[in-house]
């Protein structure tokens, strides 16, 4: 495959509500007009697909209705948000970018963003 550089932050800490956001940036070698973005999770040497979306430049980035991901695109950057995360979801989240159209096809895979998720402490009972 024709390789493409993809950059993403090394570490992100999820919010107390289990939401993590990060930017996935790709160095487009050509004039990309349709892009597919896939988020992969790597844990214990197993890789699973978290979510994926294909978008046309100038159009909104739409994931499936039941997806835990949302996102927006701007130029060669995709702002990804993953929600509903719990401590057990801590892991390496890899951004995979494919330039689908026009040809030629390009593929880029980032080094991954380590997302740390800490479950909030339950609120202590208050005496009022």
């Amino acid at each position: 495959c024709k390789a493409m550089h993809v950059a993403q932050p090394a570490v992100v800490l999820a919010s107390s509500r289990g939401i993590a956001s990060f930017v996935c940036e790709y160095a487009s070698p050509g004039k990309a007009t349709e892009v597919r973005v896939t988020v992969l999770r790597q844990a214990d040497s197993q890789v699973t697909e978290v979510c994926a979306a294909t978008y046309m430049m100038g159009n909104e980035l739409t994931f499936l209705d039941d997806s835990i991901c949302t996102g927006t695109s701007s130029g060669n950057q995709v702002n990804l948000t993953i929600q509903g995360l719990r401590a057990m979801d801590t892991g390496l989240y890899i951004c995979k970018v494919e330039l689908m159209y026009p040809p030629p096809y390009y593929l880029g895979i980032g080094n991954g963003t380590q997302i740390y998720v800490i479950d909030p402490e339950p609120c202590p009972d208050s005496d009022f």
Epitope: C1, K31, T33, E34, T54, M56, M57, G58, N59, M100, Y101, P102, P103, P104, Y105, L107
Partner: antibody, heavy 120, light 112 residues
Framework: EVQLRQSGPELVKPGTSVKISCKAS????????INWVKQNHGKSLEWIGD????????NSNQKFEGKATLTVDKSSSTAYMELRSLTSEDSAVYYC?????????????WGQGTSVTVSS | DIVMTQAAFSNPVTLGTSASISCRSS???????????LYWYLQKPGQSPQLLIY???NLASGVPDRFSSSGSGTDFTLRISRVEAEDVGVYYC?????????FGAGTKLELK
């Protein structure tokens, strides 16, 4: 039902320009690229270029740069191609066609074609 | 540009028999992603072209399974198992491995 309806035949003089239209219906216009293809009468097909209806971004065949200009009007779900400095070599049938990502960007629906005849 | 080469005419075929149409590309259309960027279109007399096959061997919606396609990276064959009168027309192979998209000159299917 998906349809691409093209404007009618054109008889134009050498050196002039012509603008042909392709009105889309039956699907969300901004979800698919529109391609333009030239067919010299009874001959093969030549790809002219494509346009992204969202932002008007185009990809084109170098052979047609300076000859064809592709535009869209999102409000009317219509794609346009303007051909300028016409010569007899431009006499042909021109098709618009929709690209479908599920078919790996094949042209799955075509307009009925617009015949352009350049003659003095 | 990638050149797609086709014979102008097929061998005349009898209704109900099989027909083969060949196409050759000047460069392999098999990408390292495993996809072969080869397409077949049919233009019936007086009509616009219509998509038959995408990604070398996949039938587009509504295309009868009498049609099939196979090939290597550069040599491709479209087969029609039982030719019907409505199959008459010009068959074009095309590539979209790279820009510009290119078509073959077309092969006319003729009946005996």
């Amino acid at each position: 039902e998906v349809q691409l309806r093209q404007s009618g035949p054109e008889l134009v003089k050498p050196g002039t320009s012509v603008k042909i239209s392709c009105k889309a219906s039956g699907y969300k216009f901004t979800d698919h690229f529109i391609n333009w293809v030239k067919q010299n009468h009874g001959k093969s097909l030549e790809w002219i270029g494509d346009i992204n209806p969202n932002n008007g971004g185009t990809n084109s065949n170098q052979k047609f740069e300076g000859k064809a200009t592709l535009t869209v009007d999102k409000s009317s779900s219509t794609a346009y191609m303007e051909l300028r400095s016409l010569t007899s070599e431009d006499s042909a049938v021109y098709y618009c066609a929709r690209l479908r990502r599920e078919y790996f960007y094949a042209m799955d629906y075509w307009g009925q074609g617009t015949s352009v005849t350049v003659s003095s | 540009d990638i050149v797609m080469t086709q014979a102008a005419f097929s061998n005349p075929v009898t209704l109900g028999t099989s027909a083969s149409i060949s196409c050759r590309s000047s460069k392999s259309l098999l990408h390292s992603n495993g996809i072969t960027y080869l397409y077949w279109y049919l233009q019936k007399p007086g009509q616009s072209p219509q998509l038959l096959i995408y990604q070398m061997s996949n039938l587009a919606s509504g295309v009868p399974d009498r049609f099939s396609s196979s090939g290597s990276g550069t040599d491709f064959t479209l087969r029609i198992s039982r030719v019907e009168a409505e199959d008459v027309g010009v068959y074009y192979c095309a590539q979209n491995l790279e820009l510009p998209l290119t078509f073959g000159a077309g092969t006319k299917l003729e009946l005996k």
